[in-house]
Interface confidence: low
């Protein structure tokens, strides 16, 4: 749904904003600036992202942020233009390193 503005908005998250567990990966300068395509979140039994843009983005979780999350799973949220860690239970902090 509209949450995808945050599942894609993360890429754009400003470096100077200190939001817990958000890290901005290096910008892709060639990325097109304006699109109002409506990416849909995958839902069980629902539409499977059919409106998502075809252009495949490199997921920084598979590259420079591969080992970033200590006790958690790396998540790349496109709109935010950044990486976040989904922490395992009992862990928190930017890299899920605190208990």
């Amino acid at each position: 749904g509209l949450n995808d503005i945050f599942e894609a908005q993360k890429i754009e998250w400003h470096e100077s904003v200190r939001v817990e567990q958000v890290v901005k990966p290096p910008q892709n300068k060639t990325e097109s600036e304006n699109t109002s395509d409506k990416p849909k979140r995958k839902k069980k039994g629902g539409k499977n992202g059919k409106n998502r843009r075809n252009r495949k983005k490199k997921n920084p979780c598979n590259a420079e942020f591969q080992n970033f999350c200590i006790h958690g799973e790396c998540k790349y949220i496109e709109h935010l233009e950044a990486v976040t860690c989904k922490c395992q239970q009992e862990y928190f902090g930017e890299r899920c390193g605190e208990k």
């Epitope: 749904g1 509209l2 949450n3 503005i5 945050f6 599942e7 894609a8 908005q9 754009e12 998250w13 400003h14 100077s16 904003v17 939001v19 817990e20 567990q21 958000v22 990325e31 600036e33 304006n34 699109t35 109002s36 395509d37 409506k38 979140r41 839902k43 958690g72 949220i77 709109h79 935010l80 233009e81 976040t84 860690c85 989904k86 922490c87 928190f92 899920c96």
Partner: antibody, heavy 124, light 111 residues
């Protein structure tokens, strides 16, 4: 202190246009997605538009799509809503709201700060 | 669209008693272990104010007498003990799927 101040509301005839502004202060405006939400005279709240931090992504409900355009100027800490082909059903108090999306590493679609609103009346 | 139905439309509660407001969604608004349902309070002449996010998380600075519960399609806002300053209209808001939708509101009066 986070502040959002809307302006630009007016009385306009059906079919007319209007541009609303929302000036933000007290936070790093460029770091937050923003939305416009309106409240009808019957006190119903309706989401109008959302824009991502870098303005790459914009979202609208079908009721305003093609008529309203949300935009932002991060250098001026200002959010805009250009409204055209206005209808009587667009009469409402228009609020701008800030999205604070991440709590404890999980996304939640929170509109945590709202302005005081600006009134738009569409009538002949 | 996911529609939200709030009930009751209005209620009057005595000071110190419990106020319970229901919000029912036309389909599930859960995703990835969370419910994308928020509660807002609005007083006359003021904008809405966030109380509860993700169904049960209390917003910072909001008194602990406010609590939210529920998942899937059925959600509840409880206020206990009710205080004079709680007289307001309360709205639920779903954002699991666009368009974002708000409930019709529940007006709380303190007796």
């Amino acid at each position: 202190e986070v502040k959002l101040m809307e302006s630009g509301g007016d009385l306009v005839k059906p079919g007319g246009s209007l541009k609303l502004s929302c000036v933000a202060s007290g936070f790093t405006f460029s770091g937050y997605p923003m939305s416009w939400v309106r409240q009808t005279p019957e006190k119903r709240l309706e989401w109008v538009a959302t824009i991502s931090t870098g303005a790459r992504h914009t979202y609208y409900p079908d009721s305003v799509k093609g008529r309203f355009t949300i935009s932002r100027d991060n250098a001026k800490n200002t959010l805009y809503l250009q409204m055209s082909s206005l209808r009587s059903e667009d009469t409402a108090m228009y609020y701008c709201a800030r999205h604070e999306g991440l709590r404890r590493g999980k996304y939640h679609c929170i509109m945590d700060y709202w302005g005081q609103g600006t009134s738009v009346t569409v009538s002949s | 669209d996911i529609l939200l139905t709030q009930s009751p439309a209005s209620l009057a509660v005595s000071l110190g008693q419990r106020a319970t407001i229901s919000c029912k969604a036309s389909q599930s608004i859960d995703y990835d272990g969370d419910s994308f349902l928020n509660w807002y309070q609005q007083k006359p002449g003021q904008p809405p104010k966030l109380l509860i996010y993700a169904a049960s998380n209390l917003e910072s600075g909001i008194p602990a007498r406010f609590s939210g519960s529920g998942s899937g399609t059925d959600f509840t806002l409880n206020i206990h003990p009710v205080e004079e300053e709680d007289a307001a209209t309360y709205y639920c808001h779903q954002c699991n799927e666009d368009p974002y939708m708000f409930g019709g509101g529940t007006k709380l009066e303190i007796r």
